[in-house]
């Protein structure tokens, strides 16, 4: 039976046409089956560290060793792949760091950073100084191994100079890379010495070589691409969010819910309310009201903003997130103070959210 009674039958609009709602990427650790993997929790000043995998508490077992800030997985299997998190609990707050583990036969490391394109990579030479091709920005080429989640965009760059201006071509696994070799083709931006592949799939895995040449010479550089296949999982909510808040009567406040979900999440903000002076219905279940939800008429559903609050707004606010796999929810309390008891700051605002893909 339901765990609550809705005060009013809120008619939910159809879901908004989805955007790519996840923005930043966790670090990706790749291991081959059978290998051991060690990850250090990259959080400082941790009094107590707890670990989760796909939102479920992770404890030590015969293959998982937890020592201080280190997580060791012995004899990794594909089942160990997933979204991991370590949470550092301190006396005043807690912080969570997320990373992905991918156990696959492919060798790779890291993931592709989104360099800002700059025409400064296009170097013009004095027409008298004939020169063989050379690299103009080796820093952008240092990372040879790229592990990128499926459906993301990959950009490989080989900024070069020379006189006359060199030409650039690309090879995949040592052979000419043709547009028809991948669905959707690829883009080459000669001005920025880059190869761009959108919406990568597992068949894009391999070695990509840029060959830069003019009549005075030829240079080349090879990148290895691994496409990390993801596992669908229940929504995962960042620990500590939404955070408890306090404000004075007439003040404004924001609650933030930070969601990690491959599958499109549906977000609801719910509050315990009273009906006819009672917090509970005849069935003993609490009365709840949906204040906001993701949908066509709702922008930025992961933030609940309350303006000009009254004492009646005090209470527990629940961020409930669902995708087709499962649900997750976390709550926070709002304390509303009389004007003369103003806290240190009137407006309690937490960091702006971003989705993770």
């Amino acid at each position: 039976r339901p765990s609550f009674s809705l005060v009013e039958d809120t008619t939910l609009e159809p879901e908004e046409p989805p955007t790519k709602y996840q923005i930043s990427q966790p670090e990706v650790y790749v291991a081959a089956p059978g290998e051991s993997l060690e990850v250090r929790c990259l959080l400082k000043d941790a009094a107590v560290i707890s670990w989760t995998k796909d939102g479920v508490h992770l404890g030590p077992n015969n293959r998982t060793v937890l020592i201080g800030e280190y997580l060791q997985i012995k004899g990794a299997t594909p089942r160990d792949s997933g979204l991991y998190a370590c949470t550092a609990s301190r006396t005043v707050d807690s912080e969570t760091w997320y990373f992905m583990v991918n156990v696959t036969d492919a060798i790779s490391s890291g993931d592709d950073e989104d360099d800002t394109d700059g025409a400064e990579d296009f170097v013009s030479e004095n027409s008298n100084n004939k020169r063989a091709p050379y690299w103009t920005n080796t820093e952008k080429m240092e990372k040879r191994l790229h592990a990128v989640p499926a459906a993301n965009t990959v950009k490989f760059r080989c900024p070069a100079g020379g006189n006359p201006m060199p030409t650039m071509r690309w090879l995949k696994n040592g052979k000419e890379f043709k547009q028809e070799h991948r669905i959707g083709g690829y883009k080459v931006r000669n001005q920025h010495w880059s190869l761009i592949m959108e919406s990568v799939v597992p068949s894009d895995k391999g070695n990509y070589t840029c060959v830069v040449e003019n009549e005075y010479g030829s240079i080349n550089h090879t990148y290895h691409l691994d496409v990390v296949e993801r596992s669908p999982h229940r929504p995962i909510l960042q620990a500590g969010l939404p955070a408890n808040a306090s404000t004075v009567v007439g003040g404004d406040v924001e609650f933030v819910c930070k969601v990690y979900s491959d599958a499109q999440p549906h977000i609801q903000w719910i509050k315990h309310v009273e009906k006819n002076g009672s917090k509970y219905g005849p069935d003993g279940l609490p009365y709840l009201k949906v204040l906001k939800h993701s949908g066509i008429n709702s922008s930025n559903a992961e933030v609940l903003a309350l303006f000009n609050v009254t004492e009646a707004d005090a209470g527990e606010y629940i961020c409930k997130v669902s995708n087709y796999i499962g649900q997750a929810n976390q709550s926070a309390w709002l304390t509303v103070l009389p004007k003369q008891q103003a806290p240190g700051r009137e407006k309690e605002i937490t960091a702006s959210p971003d989705y993770l893909e």
């Epitope: 039976r1 339901p2 765990s3 609550f4 159809p14 879901e15 046409p17 989805p18 790519k20 709602y21 796909d54 089942r79 792949s81 997933g82 499926a150 459906a151 919406s199 990568v200 799939v201 597992p202 496409v227 296949e229 993801r230 596992s231 669908p232 999982h233 229940r234 491959d262 599958a263 499109q264 549906h266 669902s322 995708n323 087709y324 796999i325 499962g326 649900q327």
Partner: antibody, heavy 116, light 106 residues
């Protein structure tokens, strides 16, 4: 391993009701949505709705509201779908399906035949 | 609701040939999911999150696309690949399936 085992075939008369069960094992039943799908003979797949056993949240395809009722018994890790006021067009194979850990699992299907 | 249209309805090819199955959505979806079904059997999850192969699915299968247009490709058909393939979206309730593409031996 994860298993979804559905109840056997049913033959019902028009106007009657039928309750199809889906017994699960090998995973935490309460932590994942259980979805139900209809497939009429020789036809494609049609989404009916889902139940979240932990709190009994339900989400129905509007077309099946009033026709299907989804429930769950957490003590036996079993999901149920009751179809009411049966008509000949309800004759179909009904599947339960859900994600557990990182994979999708389907029951073997239950054939419900509505015939006078 | 989001309507998924699969084309062609029937695709007749020979083993060894390349197969391209399309799924078009009436409005944008985040990801597409694909299932294979053989007569008398339950659908089997085949591709999830647009491009990821379900466990045990051979590498000759691949999925791609974004927005409203998605594709399932089989690089070189094997006899066991002949079946009905359905696409599905989990982005916006009510979750919907395409009408299916029947891949048959020529």
């Amino acid at each position: 391993q994860v298993q979804l085992v559905q109840s056997g075939a049913e033959v019902k008369k028009p106007g009657a009701s039928v309750k199809v069960s889906c017994k699960t094992s090998g995973y935490t039943f309460t932590s994942y949505w259980m979805h139900w799908v209809k497939q009429a003979p020789g036809q494609g797949l049609e989404y009916i709705g889902a139940i979240y056993p932990e709190n009994a949240d339900t989400d129905y395809n509007q077309k099946f509201k009033g026709k299907a009722t989804l429930t769950a018994d957490t003590s036996t890790s079993t999901a149920y779908m009751e179809l009411s006021s049966l008509r000949s067009e309800d004759t179909a194979v009904y599947y339960c399906t859900g994600y557990a850990y990182d994979a999708a699992y389907w029951g073997q299907g239950t054939l419900v035949t509505v015939s006078s | 609701e989001i309507v998924l249209t699969q084309s062609p309805a029937t695709l007749s090819l020979s083993p060894g040939e390349r197969a391209t199955l399309s799924c078009s959505a009436s409005s944008s979806v985040s990801y597409m999911y694909w299932y294979q079904q053989k007569p008398g059997q339950a659908p089997r999850p085949w591709i999830y999150l647009t491009s990821n192969l379900a466990s045990g699915i051979p590498a000759r299968f691949s999925g791609s696309g974004s927005g409203t247009d998605f594709t399932l490709t089989i690089s070189s058909l094997e006899p066991e690949d002949f079946a009905v393939y359905y696409c599905q979206q989990w982005s916006s309730p009510p979750y919907t399936f395409g009408g299916g593409t029947k891949l048959e031996i020529k």
